[in-house]
């Protein structure tokens, strides 16, 4: 994998001696152009050979409060004829994302960063034949 | 192009807390201190009919400082014979993720939330004809 370095004199945000509590502005900045974010065809989930559905996961004490989670529609993949191909499996592509969770009963507001593993979509992989011992 | 978006209203008015000062909250980021970056499940990237590679970007001003982004290996998909099928397209599945971006004034402990569109993996889709106006 290619590594794109960015040098800086500031301590790395993940260094051992970095602050444990930081101030975060909750106004969300969008580093994507508006055009880019609108250019994600939502129909990939239907046109894919490994189609998926999206399920709403909601938590009012979390930011983002709504997260859409993918689930593969079939165990197998769909071939060119629209039939299930028993040599190919639909598998979920998962991504670890960051969320902010509000600490209970905290005033002023305190949050903690949590990692969450979410299903983003599905891909089609060749079935592995297990070799008997 | 950076577009400021609305903040986190649901989180701002929870409980009987006073309103937030400057939209800022305290965040505990200790979760990162044991674990560099966001991990990516890699077991499907080579077996998929729409295989992909990862590019790792490093940015010390960002939380997480390391992010792996997928890049589809081919424009078409790989068929059962291991050949590229140009009647199908390998497309990147994208996920909007949150990162913490250090505020620009030096090595401060102030951060802002930023949305990023991350390519997580690839899936194989059947192309459709563009409907001309």
């Amino acid at each position: 994998a290619a590594i794109i370095p960015q040098s800086s004199a500031c301590p790395n945000t993940e260094a051992k001696d970095f602050l444990q509590n930081v101030k975060v502005n909750l106004k969300v900045f969008n580093s994507l152009g508006a055009k880019v974010s609108s250019r994600r065809p939502s129909d990939y989930l239907n046109r894919s050979t490994s189609p998926w559905t999206l399920h709403r996961n909601e938590d009012p004490d979390r930011y983002p409060s709504v997260i859409w989670e993918a689930q593969c529609r079939h165990q197998r993949c769909v071939n060119a004829e629209g039939k299930l191909d028993h040599h190919m499996n639909s598998v979920l592509i998962q991504q670890e994302i960051l969320v902010l969770k509000r600490e209970p009963e905290s005033c002023p507001f305190t949050f903690r960063v949590e990692k969450m593993l979410v299903g983003v979509g599905c891909t089609c992989v060749a079935s592995i034949v297990r070799q008997a011992a | 192009r950076k577009n400021p978006k609305a903040g986190v209203p649901a989180l701002q008015k929870a409980g009987n807390c006073p309103p937030l000062e400057d939209n800022t909250v305290r965040v505990d980021i200790r979760i990162f201190n044991q674990n560099q970056g966001i991990s990516v499940p890699r077991e499907f990237q080579n077996r998929s009919s729409s295989p992909w590679d990862y590019n790792i970007t490093r940015d010390p001003h960002r939380f997480p400082s390391e992010i792996a982004e997928a890049q589809c290996r081919h424009s078409g998909c790989i068929n059962a014979q291991g050949q590229e099928d140009s009647t199908m397209n390998s497309v990147a599945i994208q996920q909007e993720i949150l990162v913490l971006r250090r505020e620009p004034q030096g090595c401060s402990n102030s951060f802002r939330l930023e949305k990023m569109l991350l390519k997580v993996g690839c899936t194989c889709v059947k192309p459709i004809v563009h409907q001309a106006a």
């Epitope: - | 140009s86 990147a92 004809v129 563009h130």
Partner: antibody
Amino acid sequence: EVQLVESGGGLVQPGRSLRLSCAASGFTFDDYAMHWVRQAPGKGLEWVSGINWNSGGIGYADSVKGRFTISRDNAKNSLYLQMNSLRAEDTALYYCARDMGGFGEFYWNFGLWGRGTLVTVSS
Amino acid sequence: EIVLTQSPATLSLSPGERATLSCRASQSVRSYLAWYQQKPGQAPRLLIYDASNRATGIPARFSGSGSGTDFTLTISSLEPEDFAVYYCQQRSNWPPATFGGGTKVEIK
């Protein structure tokens, strides 16, 4: 008016470079994958290279691989072909063509063509 | 690489006659075959895609048929503007845009 206009062709010596441009107008450029197709004088059509809407998918004919580079600038509604190490057999009329795939993906059929720009490689 | 062979190389017909052009693939391209028309000094124009689908604005006298390795473009009744060179193109196998050598339809 929906159109593609190629430019940058001309007479060039073998081994030298040339950069072709294609200006698109009358349609949303980044809704489409784009291609270069060439036609040698008095001959048939040969696909040269293609690029999808966000440059995430790129393909080349074996005859130009490693010598030609396709690129696009969506902000400028422009498609480019950087041609290096030119050979006599690259002499042709170079057409810019729009793919008919939806969402800027490849369909590999060409629904709109420019008038072409002539590249002559000769010493 | 798939080779597309078009026949005949030249077809001499009169306006009003029926034209039948053939395109044969060296291996199956399923139904992923297109037809283009090119007039002298002009760019090609897409007529038919995926063997039998007429492109936008193409008159009904143009029709395509076939699948696998054998394909036909039929012009039911030739108009004066139909005299041109016709190319077939496959998108089934890599490289995904290989063209046939062309058939010239000329006035008899």
